[in-house]
């Protein structure tokens, strides 16, 4: 028997520095977690102790903090090289700055293979990107070889900016011939490494003949065997065992997100490359693991540029940006409108001639808007200003919901109106009218939504049975502020870009902004 140790990360999302337990900015260092310096300590410790070790990343290193905003992926290449990753799969967020924003900082600089079998380049891009990413790679580990085959969510064109010259094929269809090719090369130990979410990971384990292990990402899935060491609730045991269609037991793993854990999976293979046993658990990277001093010094060196960036002007406002709780928790506020407009703008994807865009709607809990911005400071808006408005380090995500769920959400928005509670929704692409004289749960008297399958966008009444795409904070997608119906009833959830980054990009693009209060949210006469 031959034993392989797979160390894995996914959805790190720019958390190069240690973070607080909830993966936001580290405040009390003695209670902080993750970060590449701490990760390196643990990885090196395992490399020294065990003979056959692979360090893999399942995508979405890009996007999530000011590190990515400033360094645009150069930080990913630099620190992944420093940690000596063995391979990485492309995630959807690796395309956030377009294909050029992937090639220049990452693909050209990585000292490790970057993989995806289901992304096919066409047109002029085919030669430009040739050899910079691969469908699979065979890596020597000890005296054996291991094949690693990559995959990426086929929804990427709706979630990011890969352009028109990359085709995202069905994962299973694309993976099978590559795995077959590895078999003909006498590679009998094959890991599928990819970024399509836990459900697809399980399907790959079930359907792709010859895949021995699946290491996934995208859904931020936390798996654990035994008592979990922090706040994350396991979605299943680690590894999650799937019985393949040809009767094999295939371990599937994922390691939550944000570099908080290091996935640790030990696999035992027989001489024919069959998995005999698999066991392990994600390792919580808490403060009991010291940060490696040389990586930490390098982080501090790279940090300097970030501090300078946060005070630079992004754009100007010529109006007061009302982000006060007195406004945003009670009525339409122009800060809410600005943020929602930025959220929609960030999700413009012309992927189908029938649709002017794939999504037109935004909802945003008023309680998530934490500060106004005064225009009397020469109109200047900085990252620092925006960090005061959106201090929680969240993301603006894409969900699919039924109209009936949206209706419940808007009822929840005003079910206890008047108490300055955070659930009052700010909107974009939605016209809502409330009658507060009616009883809670029956206060939405009009709910019109902007069409997407139209050449001239207009507002139509919400249909209860129709499925709509909506952009919202991850906080709401996870049921925050009492929006349990969103969490329970959402049909799809894809994590998006860092909230501040979305707004800062929009302001930089617009240069001068002047959002108004324009009647998106109304109260029927006599009730307000």
């Amino acid at each position: 028997a031959w034993e392989l140790t797979i160390l894995h990360t996914n959805d790190v999302h720019s958390r190069l520095e240690q973070t607080s337990e909830d993966s936001s900015k580290c405040v009390n260092a003695s209670r902080c977690m993750g970060g590449v310096a701490r990760l390196f300590t643990k990885v090196q410790q395992i490399r020294r102790a065990e003979p056959n070790v692979l360090l893999l990343d399942a995508g979405d290193q890009y996007q999530g903090t000011i590190w990515f905003t400033v360094y645009k992926g150069a930080e990913v290449a630099h620190f992944m090289n420093a940690l000596r990753y063995d391979a990485m799969a492309l995630g959807n967020h690796e395309f956030d700055n377009g294909v050029e924003g992937l090639i220049e900082p990452l693909l050209k600089e990585a000292k490790f293979p970057i993989l995806s079998a289901n992304i096919k380049a066409k047109g002029p891009l085919a030669s430009q990107i040739s050899g910079l990413y691969l469908p699979y790679k065979v890596l020597p580990v000890g005296d054996e070889v291991v094949g690693i085959v990559g995959y990426t969510s086929k929804e990427t064109p709706f979630l990011s900016n890969p352009g028109t010259n990359l085709v995202f094929e069905d994962e299973i269809t694309a993976l099978q011939p590559e795995v077959d090719k590895l078999k003909t090369l006498n590679v009998n130990k094959i890991i599928a490494l990819g970024h399509s979410g836990f459900e697809m990971d399980k399907l790959i384990a079930q359907k792709v003949r010859g895949v021995d292990v699946v290491v996934g990402g995208h859904s931020n899935t936390f798996l654990y065997t035994g008592n979990p060491p922090s706040k994350e609730v396991p979605a299943g045991k680690y590894p999650f065992i799937v019985t393949s269609d040809d009767g094999r037991k295939v371990p599937v793993v994922q390691a939550y997100a944000f570099g908080k854990y290091l996935g640790y999976l030990k696999i035992e293979f027989d001489e024919r490359g069959n998995v005999i046993s698999s066991h392990g658990n994600p390792i919580l990277l808490n403060s009991s693991i010291p940060e490696d001093p040389s990586i930490k010094a390098d982080i501090n060196k790279w940090r300097i540029k970030l501090d300078n960036y946060s005070t630079q002007e992004l754009g100007k406002t010529i109006v007061y940006l009302d982000g006060s709780s007195q406004s945003c928790r009670f009525r339409e506020c122009n800060m809410g409108n600005l943020i929602c407009d930025a959220m929609i703008n960030n999700n413009l994807r012309h992927t189908d001639e029938m649709f002017w865009n794939h999504v037109s709607m935004c909802i945003l809990n008023g309680g998530g808007i934490r500060s106004p911005i005064d225009e009397r400071n020469n109109g200047t808006i900085t990252w620092e200003n925006l960090a005061a408005v959106l201090p929680f380090g969240g993301t603006f995500d894409l969900v699919q919901l039924k109209g009936s769920t949206l209706k419940k959400a808007f009822e929840h928005s005003v079910h206890r109106y008047g108490q300055s509670t955070g659930e009052f929704l700010q909107v974009g692409g939605i016209h809502v009218v409330y009658d507060l004289s009616r009883k809670p749960g029956d206060r939405v008297v009009k709910l019109d939504v902007l069409c997407t399958k139209c050449r001239v966008p207009s507002y139509d009444p919400l249909k209860m049975d129709e499925v709509y795409k909506v952009i919202l904070p991850n906080f709401l997608a996870n049921g925050g502020d009492g929006f349990q119906m969103i969490k329970d009833e959402l049909l799809r959830h894809d994590s998006g870009d860092q909230d501040i980054n979305v707004v800062s990009t929009y302001i930089s693009k617009m240069k001068v902004i002047y959002p108004a209060v324009e009647g998106r949210i109304k109260f029927s006469t006599g009730s307000h």
């Epitope: 990585a110 000292k111 490790f112 040739s130 050899g131 020597p140």
Partner: antibody, heavy 117, light 106 residues
Framework: QVQLVQSGAEVKKPGASVKVSCKAS????????MHWVRQAPGQGLEWIGE????????NYNEKFKSRVTLTRDTSTSTAYMELSSLRSEDTAVYYC??????????WGQGTLVTVSS | DIQMTQSPSSLSASVGDRVTITCKAS??????LSWFQQKPGKSPKLLIY???IWVDGVPSRFSGSGSGQDYTFTISSLQPEDIATYYC????????FGQGTKVEIK
């Protein structure tokens, strides 16, 4: 297939400059960094520097920094290495090489530069 | 600057022999080490990178190993066509070649 074709041999006087070219074909020139390496007669390999053809960014060996200039012409997929203030110890074969995964995969055929009075 | 010390500078072995060349870095180079083969009058050819990863088409008798500061290149069974000079290259921090090892047949 990937090919790096270098300019012909040069004979230069001490104090002069030389400019060696390296024309890339079989791949997209701007997608990979280009290295320059030299080898004096009967000696080992010595790294000179590298250039990112898409943006023109360069990294140099400290030893050559004051005398070497790496440039490129993306319209002709050609990289250039110019070495100034030549001295006899600069007599060497100069190679261009494409960078991949941080190392050098494809190499040009080499250009012999002879510095002699 | 990282220094690379390659040894031996030359060796003579018989066909079928196992040949070993070592490279020692002045500091940990994170396995970012390549091995090249250069035949007389020819350009160098990449054989192995990242300490142990073969380039496609390179015969399996060539192998690399090592980590930290110490690396080894092995020809498991020397063939007449392997007569060449072999160089290591560190690419962890910029680039430094070893001095080379000339391999001859007895």
């Amino acid at each position: 297939q990937v090919q790096l074709v270098q300019s012909g041999a040069e004979v230069k006087k001490p104090g002069a400059s030389v400019k060696v070219s390296c024309k890339a074909s079989g791949y997209t020139f701007t997608s990979y960094w280009m290295h320059w390496v030299r080898q004096a007669p009967g000696q080992g390999l010595e790294w000179i520097g590298e250039i990112n053809p898409s943006i023109g960014r360069t990294n140099y060996n400290e030893k050559f920094k004051s005398r070497v200039t790496l440039t490129r012409d993306t319209s002709t997929s050609t990289a250039y290495m110019e070495l100034s203030s030549l001295r006899s110890e600069d007599t060497a074969v100069y190679y261009c090489a494409r960078r991949v995964y941080g190392t050098m995969d494809y190499w040009g055929q080499g250009t012999l530069v002879t510095v002699s009075s | 600057d990282i220094q690379m010390t390659q040894s031996p500078s030359s060796l003579s072995a018989s066909v079928g022999d196992r040949v070993t060349i070592t490279c020692k870095a002045s500091q940990d180079i994170n396995s970012y080490l390549s091995w090249f083969q250069q035949k007389p009058g020819k350009s160098p050819k990449l054989l192995i990178y990242r300490a142990n990863i073969w380039v496609d088409g390179v015969p399996s008798r060539f192998s690399g190993s090592g980590s930290g500061q110490d690396y080894t290149f092995t020809i498991s069974s020397l063939q007449p066509e392997d007569i060449a000079t072999y160089y290591c290259l560190q690419y962890d921090e910029l680039y430094t070649f070893g001095q080379g090892t000339k391999v001859e047949i007895k």
